[in-house]
C-alpha cells in the first residue's frame, strides 16, 4: 500500500486534451499507474500512462480527439481516476469528477511576429492555439518584456483584459535587443488557470538616427 | 442529426490487414472531427485515430504506425486502414462524428477479428 499525502490536479484545453499531474509522497518511482476518463453523458473512455516528471510526480495528456474537435462542453462531467498496478490488480489511488469548463487551462499562444518596429516602440501580433469557439471573446491575456540585465520574473507584465491578438510596447530604448512573452485565460471557470508563457520573441529596436535624440 | 454507416470489418489472419470505411449522412454539414473507436473485452470504448475536417489527425498508441485514418470530405466518408494487425486489435469498431457544437454521433459498429 501507498501512504502519504496525494494530489491530483487536471486542466482542459477547450478542446480534446485533459493534462493530468499526479503527486504522491511515498510512492514507488517504477509504479505502472494510468489516468482513467469516464465521461458522464458520452460514450467513449480514454486512458494514459502517467510518467514521472520528478521525485513524487507523474503528468499525462487524454488525449480526447483531433487537437481542434469540441469534445467535451460546460455540461459534461468526467470522471478521472489514477489506477495503479499492484500485482495482477489495479488498485485506485485518486478520483474526481471533473468539470472541463471550470478547470480550463488553455494552449500557449502561437505564432508570434513582429508588425512593426521603430526606434522606441514595436507592434507583436500572436495567435490562440486549440481555443474553443465557445469562448467567443471571452478571454484575456498577459504579457511581458524581457529588457537587457532582467529576469522574466522582474518583467513587469502587462494585462489586456479582452481578446486583443496584438499589444504595442511603447517607451523601448533604441538599438536594444528585447524579447517577448504572452499567455491567455479564459473568462470561465472557478478552477482555470493561465496557459504556459509563450515561446519568447526577439526582437530588436531599431537605432535613433544620428543627429537626432 | 447525422447517421453513421460502417463497414470492411471482418476476419483477418494475424499481420494481416483491413480497411474500414464510414459514410456519413444527414446533417453533415454539422461535422468536425470524425473518429474510429473500438470496444474490445474490457467495454472500454477507446480512441483508435481521429482526423479533422482539414486533415488533422491523431492516434492511439497502441495503433501508431500500424494504422493510417483519412476522410474524403465530397463522400462525406473517413477510412481506417488496418495494417500489421494484431490479436489485440480484435474488437468492435465505432465510427464516430463530433459536431462543432460537441455533440456525438455513432455508428452500429462493425467486428474485427484477427486470429493468431
Known amino acids: 500500500a501507498v501512504n502519504g499525502t496525494s494530489r491530483f490536479t487536471c486542466f482542459y484545453n477547450s478542446r480534446a486534451n485533459i493534462s493530468c499531474v499526479w503527486s504522491q509522497d511515498g510512492a514507488l518511482q517504477d509504479t505502472s499507474c494510468q489516468v482513467h476518463a469516464w465521461p458522464d453523458r458520452r460514450r467513449w473512455n480514454q486512458t494514459c500512462e502517467l510518467l514521472p516528471v520528478s521525485q513524487a510526480s507523474w503528468a499525462c495528456n487524454l488525449i480526447l480527439g483531433t487537437p481542434d474537435s469540441q469534445k467535451l462542453t460546460a455540461v459534461d462531467i468526467v470522471t478521472l481516476r489514477v489506477m495503479c498496478r499492484e500485482g495482477v490488480r489495479w488498485r485506485m489511488m485518486a478520483i474526481q469528477d471533473f468539470k472541463p469548463f471550470e478547470n480550463l487551462r488553455l494552449m500557449a499562444p502561437i505564432s508570434l511576429q513582429v508588425v512593426h518596429v521603430e526606434t522606441h516602440r514595436c507592434n507583436i501580433s500572436w495567435k490562440i492555439s486549440q481555443a474553443s469557439h465557445y469562448f467567443e471573446r471571452h478571454l484575456e491575456f498577459e504579457a511581458r518584456t524581457l529588457s537587457p540585465g532582467h529576469t522574466w520574473e522582474e518583467a513587469p507584465l502587462m494585462t489586456l483584459k479582452q481578446k486583443q491578438e496584438w499589444i504595442c510596447l511603447e517607451t523601448l530604448t533604441p538599438d536594444t535587443q528585447y524579447e517577448f512573452q504572452v499567455r491567455v485565460k479564459p473568462l470561465q471557470g472557478e478552477f482555470t488557470t493561465w496557459s504556459p508563457w509563450s515561446q519568447p520573441l526577439a526582437f530588436r529596436t531599431k537605432p535613433a538616427a544620428l543627429g537626432k535624440d | 442529426q447525422v447517421q453513421l454507416q460502417e463497414s470492411g470489418g471482418g476476419l483477418v489472419q494475424a499481420g494481416g490487414s483491413l480497411r474500414l470505411s464510414c459514410v456519413a449522412s444527414?446533417?453533415?454539414?454539422?461535422?468536425?472531427?470524425m473518429a474510429w473507436y473500438r470496444q474490445g473485452a474490457d467495454n472500454q470504448r477507446v480512441l483508435v485515430a481521429a482526423i479533422s475536417r482539414v486533415g488533422n489527425t491523431a492516434y492511439g498508441d497502441s495503433v501508431k504506425g500500424r494504422f493510417t485514418i483519412s476522410r474524403q470530405n465530397a463522400r462525406n466518408t473517413v477510412y481506417l486502414q488496418m495494417n500489421s494487425l494484431k490479436p489485440e486489435d480484435t474488437a468492435v469498431y465505432y465510427c464516430n462524428a463530433d459536431s462543432w457544437g460537441g455533440d456525438d454521433y455513432w455508428g452500429q459498429g462493425t467486428q474485427v477479428t484477427v486470429s493468431s
Open positions: 444527414g446533417s453533415v454539414s454539422s461535422i468536425n472531427g
